[in-house]
Interface confidence: low
């Protein structure tokens, strides 16, 4: 079941998933000037069995100007470089978490992908919190949150993290302290309020998402 909420708000903190539970959806978003191919998927879906999980569907972007040419999925090096650093790729993932049964790794980028990724999490998903640059973590417990089902409703557990305004940064599990971090968050993303949702649909609806009421079509 999809979590009908986003993880809790922690002032001056961001979160990250190290691996994605089966059922997680990732929107197929294209960068400005590009669009999904007409017959293309709206999202990728983490699927699998007990031994292996992978992302179903491929995201494909084509130039908004050209109607019928599709772009290959393999990204060019310069396109990977221009992606925002908000997408930390698999080197960041602790091996034990990324290889968990029933979980998918961060999908590789596709050509002309949008700069930010949009995930729809499912029950059981865990995310880890980190203080933004310029703030230091005070831990009272785990700096993580899990989406749980309680009495038929989904909720995220409260991470035990406080970020104080000292010029130090905390790390994700298994992450080294950055040296003048090229992977640090862009300044525009260090604001401290948070966002969330009410995406109340069952995971079995994922197959029909293309025609669901949550999808708006071009007029």
């Amino acid at each position: 079941e999809l979590c009908d909420d986003d993880p809790p708000e922690i002032p001056h903190a961001t979160f990250k998933a190290m691996a994605y539970k089966e059922g997680t959806m990732l929107n197929c978003e294209c960068k400005r000037g590009f669009r999904r191919i007409k017959s293309g998927s709206l999202y990728m879906l983490c699927t699998g069995n007990s031994s292996h999980s992978s992302w179903d569907n491929q995201c494909q972007c084509t130039s908004s100007a050209t109607r019928n040419t599709t772009k290959q999925v393999t990204p060019q090096p310069e396109e990977q470089k221009e992606r925002k650093t908000t997408e930390m790729q698999s080197p960041m993932q602790p091996v034990d978490q990324a290889s968990l049964p029933g979980h998918c790794r961060e999908p590789p980028p596709w050509e002309n992908e949008a700069t930010e990724r949009i995930y729809h999490f499912v029950v059981g998903q865990m995310v880890y919190y980190q203080c933004v640059q310029g703030y230091r973590a005070l831990h009272r417990g785990p700096a993580e949150s899990v989406c749980k089902m309680t009495h038929g409703k989904t909720r995220w557990t409260q991470p035990q993290l406080i970020c104080t305004g000292e010029m130090e940064t905390s790390q994700f599990p298994g992450e080294e302290k950055p040296q003048a971090s090229p992977e640090g968050r862009p300044e525009s993303e260090t604001s401290c309020l948070v966002t969330t949702t009410d995406f109340q649909i069952q995971t079995e609806m994922a197959a029909t998402m293309e025609t669901s009421i949550f999808t708006t079509e071009y007029q």
């Epitope: 990724r117 604001s191 969330t196 995406f199 999808t215």
Partner: nanobody
């Protein structure tokens, strides 16, 4: 990819109420976007009014409208609303609906700055007379 159209603007007496709507269209999942309302009075900057997270769990308001304005959204209808109660003459402005892409890999917060929004509507005029 996302088109926004505001409606519901008009004239209202001070102390009255008005409800603005913003309908989204485009082949995309509406619940992927955080939404906000901004307003621009003649000769002034476009100011943040309030924002709502993609599933409506979190909201944020400018101090000037707190306890008077309420933002809500209906993802099934791809619409965000601004309920304006106890209006004041200083609420007179063009009201704009805006959207930003939520990022789930690194957390993207509720945005309050206009340059953080990628999608904008054309605006709807609200006039509050005393």
């Amino acid at each position: 990819q996302l088109q926004l159209v505001e409606s519901g603007g008009g004239s209202v007496q001070a102390g009255g109420s008005l409800r603005l709507s913003c309908a989204a269209s485009g082949r995309t999942l509406y619940s992927s976007y955080g939404m906000a309302w901004f307003r621009q009075a003649p000769g002034k900057e476009r100011d943040f009014v309030g924002s709502i997270s993609r599933y409506g769990t979190y909201t944020s308001y400018a101090d000037s409208v707190k306890d008077r304005f309420t933002i809500s959204r209906d993802n099934a209808k791809s619409t965000v609303y601004l309920q304006m109660n106890n209006t004041k003459p200083e609420d007179t402005a063009v009201y704009y609906c805006a959207a930003y892409t939520y990022s789930g890999s690194f957390y993207s917060t509720v945005k309050t700055h206009r340059d953080e929004y990628q999608y904008w509507g054309q605006g709807t005029q609200v006039t509050v007379s005393s």
